[in-house]
């Protein structure tokens, strides 16, 4: 169970609930696949946490067990053109460390113009986690299609 | 990490473990394009521990960050069913107070007949969430294959 | 809240933290549609903290409200091929004991290769879940694309 | 509200063909599937098939295809149901109907129907 | 194809008494929480008219001595109060696949 606010003395980001909700910022030039997002109550309902933006990318600042969750929506797009433009790939992994780099969850569009999907993942204080989108079809930037999160649920 | 039981006297409700999980009652009349949902142990595997149901809408009662998720299964639907009475797209939204309007999560079946996906999200205390299915086809009453839920993260 | 490390003497899993995130071994014989899983820091990104693998499939060891969720990608798969093959359809449920045996979640991949989902269920101490894979294609056994997990929420 | 406007009743000799029409008002043509019923006289209703307005795409009934074609012209908002090598069991009134808001068929709108009699 | 089967095929009632017809599938017409059996009247010279669609649902403008009930391949139409006005052929109808077939109808007759 959670503990009682009324005995809990130290600030929330010190017990582990580092958690994160970003909406897209950008996509890279042409040769780098990866989604650069941001977050933050001035752009709406994206926040972070304890897990800080580098350059777009999110780094994680706790050791434990995370919930990633990531859902794309592709712009100006119908089933006919997500299996024209295919394969549409989504991947999300660590980036850096280079060390720790490794694919953790990975999506094909084809003929749908959503993926959305979620899996528990060990992740290290220092983990950069990179979301590269492969093919010719941009992302949507609206935020209730495109987001990226991750939550802390247990060292 | 979650407080040892031995030393938790408050209940449950009182440490923030708001949750709920629902699943389909009915659609609304043809120009209601919401969802209603129903929850409690009497009908299944749904419950409802914190947030309330408002006229088959999910009520919120404590603030904080929530993971919200969903999965709506259309009715007798095949590929070719689902790409022929495009678009039917389905979305999550806070409905009301007005003035905290907006919409959380969207996505379009194209040529699936299920959508999934979940989202982490700020809601404050009387916020009622909406799930609106707009397109000409029924979701499906299985409890396996539509449902509808939040669980609470963190203030 | 969490508690505090600094206050919390107790082994983590005596406090409800079980959680599991599992990578798929292999399918069963012809007539069995189950999948087959596993889990440990050996096989990579995968644990079982709390649940066990009985014959590859999870038991669960505490009594509680868990998050359970899924993806599983189709091997050499395009959306012709699932279209093709259809109807191939995942389902997640209790399988034992026989007294409780219920689909929790389902979906069918249409014309898609990927399904992933994720819903809250009660669930009780020795309630074994199975995932069917009913269909003539075969599951990726990459460990980005296919994987299983549940996650205890509250009591 | 929604108008289902059939073509008048027809006289045809056994092997010809029959082409019966089907305007529609009072909603957007492209939006709704048209499907065709007929009734043999004192006999119950059978289903033909079914033609999507919005793509010309259709599904026929077994028992008649090589026989049946469903067409529509957007331009006027008008289906047709031509059937052809007419035998004299082909004697009855066919109706188009139209399926209400969700995309399931079943049918709160019809015309009036139109009778086709085969008779040398 | 699915087979519908009406009983009986013939039925006189007095007005103020319970009319009841029955439709039995040859399989099962429910899916995904819905049974997809709907039930029409008829009158000589007239098109069908829906009266109830997805088994118990009334449609709207249809007076409420109209019901339905049933589920998997047993259907039931209940008219409750019988009136004068509701002499008529009664037709149930499933729509759970292609083709969509018809019961072979219910003549109910008012003594």
């Known amino acids: 169970q959670r503990f009682a606010q009324a005995q809990q003395q130290l600030p929330l980001e010190s017990l582990g609930w580092d958690v994160a909700e970003l909406q897209l910022n950008h996509t890279g030039p042409q040769q780098d696949p990866r989604l650069y997002w941001q977050g933050g109550p001035a752009l709406g309902r994206s926040f972070l946490h304890g897990p800080e933006l580098d350059k777009g990318q999110l780094r994680i600042h706790r050791d434990g067990i995370y919930m990633v969750h990531i859902q794309v929506t592709l712009a100006i797009c119908s089933s006919t053109t997500a299996s024209r433009h295919h394969p549409t790939t989504l991947a999300v992994g660590i980036c850096s460390p280079a060390s720790r780099s490794i694919s953790l969850l990975r999506l094909s569009f084809h003929q749908g113009c959503t993926i959305a999907s979620q899996r528990l993942t060990p992740l290290a204080r220092g983990d950069t986690l990179c979301t590269n989108l492969t093919g010719t079809l941009l992302p949507s930037r609206n935020t209730d299609e495109t987001f990226f999160g991750v939550q802390w649920v247990r060292p | 990490q979650r407080f040892a039981q031995a030393q938790q006297q408050l209940p449950l409700e009182s440490l923030g473990w708001d949750v709920a999980e629902l699943q389909l009652n009915h659609t609304g009349p043809q120009q209601d394009p919401r969802l209603y949902w129903q929850g409690g142990p009497a009908l299944g595997r749904s419950f409802l521990h914190g947030p309330e149901l408002d006229k088959g809408q999910l009520r919120i009662h404590r603030d904080g960050i929530y993971m919200v998720h969903i999965q709506v299964t259309l009715a007798i639907c095949s590929s070719t069913t689902a790409s022929r009475h495009h678009p039917t797209t389905l979305a999550v939204g806070i409905c009301s107070p007005a003035s905290r309007s907006i919409s959380l999560l969207r996505l379009s079946f194209h040529q699936g007949c299920t959508i999934a996906s979940q989202r982490l999200t700020p809601l404050a205390r009387g916020d009622t969430l909406c799930t609106n299915l707009t397109g000409t086809l029924l979701p499906s009453r299985n409890t396996d294959e539509t449902f509808f839920g939040v669980q609470w993260v963190r203030p | 809240q969490r508690f505090a490390q600094a206050q919390q003497q107790l082994p983590l899993e005596s406090l409800g933290w079980d959680v599991a995130e599992l990578q798929l071994n292999h399918t069963g014989p012809q007539q069995d549609p189950r999948l087959y899983w596993q889990g440990g820091p050996a096989l990579g990104r995968s644990f079982l903290h709390g649940p066990e693998l009985d014959k590859g499939q999870l038991r669960i060891h505490r009594d509680g409200i868990y998050m359970v969720h899924i993806q599983v990608t189709l091997a050499i798969c395009s959306s012709t091929t699932a279209s093709r093959h259809h109807p191939t359809t995942l389902a997640v449920g209790i399988c034992s004991p026989a007294s409780r045996s219920i689909s929790l979640l389902r979906l069918s991949f249409h014309q898609g290769c990927t399904i992933a989902s994720q819903r809250l269920t009660p669930l009780a101490r020795g309630d074994t879940l199975c995932t069917n894979l009913t269909g003539t294609l075969l599951p990726s056994r990459n460990t980005d694309e296919t994987f299983f997990g549940v996650q205890w929420v509250r009591p | 509200q929604v108008q289902l406007v059939q073509s008048g009743a027809e006289v045809k000799k056994p092997g010809a063909s029959v082409k019966v029409s089907c305007k529609v008002s009072g909603y957007t043509f492209t939006d709704s599937a048209l499907h065709w019923v007929r009734q043999a006289p004192g006999k119950g209703l059978e289903w033909m098939g079914v033609?999507?307005?919005?793509?010309?795409?259709?599904d026929y009934n077994q028992k008649f295809k090589g026989r049946v074609t469903m067409t529509e012209d957007t331009s006027t908002d008008t289906a047709y149901m031509e059937l052809s090598s007419l035998r004299s069991e082909d004697t009855a009134v066919y109706y188009c109907?139209?399926?209400?808001?969700?995309?399931?068929?079943?049918?709160?709108?019809w015309g009036q129907g139109t009778l086709v009699t085969v008779s040398a | 194809d699915i087979v519908l089967t009406q009983s009986p095929a013939s039925l006189a009632v007095s007005p103020g008494q319970r009319a009841t017809i029955t439709c039995r599938a040859s399989k099962s017409v429910s899916a995904s929480g819905y049974s997809f059996l709907h039930w029409y009247q008829q009158k000589p010279g007239q098109p069908p008219k829906l009266l109830i669609y997805?088994?118990?649902n009334l449609e709207s403008g249809v007076p409420a001595r109209f019901s339905g009930s049933g589920s998997g391949t047993d259907f039931t139409l209940t008219i409750n109060p019988v009136e004068a006005e509701d002499t008529a052929n009664y037709y149930c109808?499933?729509?759970?696949?292609?083709?969509?077939?018809f019961g072979g109808g219910t003549k109910v007759e008012i003594k």
């Open positions: 109808q499933h729509s759970r696949e292609l083709p969509p077939t």
């Open positions: 109907a139209r399926r209400g808001y969700y995309d399931y068929d079943w049918f709160p709108y």
């Open positions: 033609i999507s307005t919005y793509d010309g795409d259709t």
């Open positions: 997805l088994a118990s």
